[in-house]
Interface confidence: low
């Protein structure tokens, strides 16, 4: 926990001479910033700078080159990381007065003259003097109003609806504020704000529509912040619905949208009576033209086991909404003739999910499958090859005598997907061939024996072993194996 920053001069308040310069130094254990009375537009003569020092503390200096009445107010030094939108700043404060014989009251913005109260709540009429010694009275149509006054805040009390004027006398000269108007309103302690954007994705030329609704509050200041705001591009509307309860519906319409209108659309509602603020935001994207993106969740070569049930899922992002179709080997998939089904579901505004489902995979389901997504502006496709994996099986095992040479060839034909591998084994002692230990793998490096293998098509393979001379009776075994299984046959 950091201790509060400290301010030099170490005072709660300070009176500064008109047109003189003054500086406030803030020291903290972490990075510190200043909050001061003037808005950024007005603060051209307020300079904030960081300063080096040997103490190991962070030092930020606020310097005013020429003090005016407008510099009167509360200066707060706070740790950067503690600043939040909602809470009052936690930090160290000093109140500066800049007495000006020609400006009795600190200048205010027009909204400060509207004082809104709820029911019988107390309120502050914020006429603050530039000189703490100036006596001030509060008047309404009936005369002087008794209320407690604090030169840092103004008059505090329970006020009836109507206009109020603050009056002060400085060196025999009388000053009056313009009227502060006190209004009574219906308001809730929390702002109930709802934002609705039926669409968040558009293309050029379309009209963006965003609405914000405030419930159970009579007077709300609602500000829109959006990319086209500086150009005054949007049209704002307010609709007041009173039945069954108060509802203020603010609508922002941006016609003829362009890519530059992409960004955050924010409505910030503020209750007129208290510092209750609520914000809602939606991100709108405007595209030059429609688009389609296809994101498969599988690769371009996929395998499925015989009789297996398998789903292939493709994510599609598209605007405007796409038409999605599936092809097999470049022909439209006719689902009712196969145990293959496809479907499309909308996941989000521009997100779709299409599934290709194989119910019981068959060999003939192998092939090239293509998903095609198209809308008025774009066409995208994704093709993948599907292999139905079939365990290896031996179709044929035959031998072929070479006549007078005494040579002999054995042919083994096997099928399966992936294509099986073929291995040969021999057993030289026929009587013992029932015993597995009598079988030895035929090595390729034996000079008088030649083995070869070739594929006939995508799923059939033929292996051959040629014995140059067979001098005794032997047993030959063909072993065909792939990922899914192995089979052997002997002769």
């Amino acid at each position: 926990q950091l201790s509060l920053p400290s301010i030099l001069p170490n005072e709660n308040e300070k009176v500064v001479q008109l047109n003189s310069s003054f500086s406030l130094r803030c020291f903290g254990e972490s990075e510190v910033s200043w909050q001061y009375p003037m808005s950024e537009e007005e603060s051209s003569d307020v300079e904030i700078r960081n300063e080096e020092n040997n103490s190991g503390l962070f030092v930020t200096v606020l310097e005013v080159s020429s003090a005016s009445a407008a510099h009167t107010g509360l200066y707060t030094c706070y740790y950067n990381h503690t600043q939040t939108e909602e809470n009052e700043l936690e930090g160290r404060h000093i109140y500066i007065y800049v007495p000006d014989p020609d400006v009795a009251f600190v200048p205010l913005g027009m909204t400060d003259y509207l004082v809104i109260v709820e029911d019988d709540d107390s309120a502050i009429i914020p006429c603050r003097t530039t000189d703490p010694e100036t006596p001030v009275t509060l008047h309404n149509s009936e005369g002087v109003v008794p209320a407690s006054y604090d030169s840092r805040q103004g008059f505090n009390g329970t006020f009836t609806v109507g206009p109020y004027i603050c009056e002060a006398t400085v060196k025999g000269k009388k000053f009056q504020t313009i009227p502060f108007n006190v209004y009574a309103l219906k308001a809730t302690s929390e702002l109930d704000l709802e934002m609705e954007a039926l669409k968040t994705v558009y293309k050029s030329g379309e009209t963006i529509v965003v609405t914000c609704a405030v419930f159970n509050n009579e007077v709300v200041d609602l500000q829109w912040t959006y990319p086209g705001e500086v150009k005054g591009k949007g049209i704002t509307m307010l609709e007041e619905i009173k039945v069954p309860s108060i509802k203020l519906v603010y609508t922002l319409t941006v016609p003829e949208a362009t890519v530059k209108d992409s960004g955050d659309y924010e409505c910030a509602a503020r209750q007129a009576t208290r510092e209750v603020k609520e914000m809602k935001k939606v991100t709108i994207s405007v595209h030059e033209k429609g688009f389609i993106e296809i994101k498969p969740t599988f690769s371009q070569l996929e395998a499925v086991n015989l009789h297996e049930v398998k789903h292939f899922v493709v994510e599609v992002r598209a605007y405007p909404p796409p038409r999605i179709s599936w092809l097999k080997n470049n022909l439209t998939l006719i689902e009712n003739l196969t145990e293959i089904t496809t479907d499309v579901e909308k996941i989000q505004e521009i997100r779709y999910r299409s599934k290709l489902k194989l119910i019981r995979a068959k060999e003939e389901d192998s092939g090239h499958y293509t998903i095609v997504a198209q809308n008025e502006d774009a066409v995208k496709s994704y093709t993948f090859e599907l292999l139905t994996q079939v365990p290896s099986s031996i179709l044929d095992l035959v031998d072929d005598h070479h006549g007078s040479t005494g040579g002999q060839t054995v042919r083994c034909t096997a099928e399966g997907t992936p294509l099986p591998d073929i291995e040969w084994m021999i057993c030289k002692d026929i009587k013992k061939c029932n015993n597995e230990t009598s079988w030895t793998i035929l090595a390729n490096n034996v000079s008088n024996i030649i083995t070869e293998i070739h594929s006939r098509d995508r799923s059939t393979v033929e292996g051959r072993v040629t014995f140059a001379k067979v001098e005794e009776t032997i047993a030959v075994r063909c072993l065909a194996k792939n990922l899914l299984g192995a089979e052997n046959r002997e002769l």
Epitope: R49, E51, E52
Partner: antibody
Framework: DVQLQESGPGLVKPSQTLSLTCTVS?????????WNWIRQPPGKGLEWVGY???????SYNPSLKSRISITRDTSKNQFSLKLSSVTAADTAVYYC??????????????WGAGTTVTVSS | DIQMNQSPSSVSASVGDRVTITCHAS??????LTWYQQKPGKAPKLLIY???NLHTGVPSRFSGSGSGTDFTLTISSLQPEDFATYYC?????????FGGGTKLEIK
């Protein structure tokens, strides 16, 4: 207009001390700002070495802290860098630069032309 | 120390091209990033401070953006005098560190 000019020997022997001076004209080094040394080995990027502020406080890059000293001569409006026990790795172009901190943010807005220092026997 | 990584390390482009250089910080540096331009045999020159603010006298074809850890320097339409090496520098955390530089060469 403020101007910075580095000076010092171009060749230093290994294990000796490198000494450079930056002369500032057009602005008093005691008025404001932090006055920095930045170096650039041949064909490489920039490395901040350290500074002396207008008030005389110093900050050094931790990687050089044990070997570095930055001092100033206010009468001549100069600040100097001393780097002891140098090796070939200290061969670089050495720049002096002013570090501004307006807007509550630090950047180097005025630079000297740089001086080349070679560490070799 | 905060590491600053620039990419690409070099780029070839022609006069009139739009060029973007990126700088990545090893930790969040908010908007405390400065861009410098350096020509051979010369000292670096300040271009952009606080991620997006153009220094006095710098042409408007230069612009900076980003916050947090990822930043970009964009030159909208390259001029002959823009061929140089560009460095980013963080001012978030001491010691101040620079990126390795991006050399912009004539194609």
């Amino acid at each position: 207009d403020v101007q910075l000019q580095e000076s010092g020997p171009g060749l230093v022997k290994p294990s000796q001390t490198l000494s450079l001076t930056c002369t500032v004209s057009g602005y008093s080094i005691t008025s404001d700002y932090a006055w920095n040394w930045i170096r650039q080995p041949p064909g490489k990027g920039l490395e901040w070495v350290g500074y002396i502020s207008y008030s005389g406080s110093t900050s050094y890059n931790p990687s050089l802290k044990s070997r570095i000293s930055i001092t100033r001569d206010t009468s001549k409006n100069q600040f100097s860098l001393k780097l002891s026990s140098v090796t070939a790795a200290d061969t670089a172009v050495y720049y002096c630069a002013r570090r501004d901190y307006r807007y509550g943010y630090w950047y180097f807005d005025v630079w000297g032309a740089g001086t080349t220092v070679t560490v070799s026997s | 120390d905060i590491q600053m990584n620039q990419s690409p390390s070099s780029v070839s482009a022609s006069v009139g091209d739009r060029v973007t250089i990126t700088c990545h910080a090893s930790q969040n540096i908010h908007v405390w990033l400065t861009w410098y331009q350096q020509k051979p045999g010369k000292a670096p020159k300040l271009l952009i401070y606080k991620a997006s603010n153009l220094h006095t006298g710098v042409p408007s074809r230069f612009s900076g953006s980003g916050s947090g850890t990822d930043f970009t320097l964009t030159i909208s339409s390259l001029q002959p005098e823009d061929f140089a090496t560009y460095y980013c520098q963080q001012g978030q955390s001491y010691p101040w560190t620079f990126g390795g530089g991006t050399k912009l060469e004539i194609k």
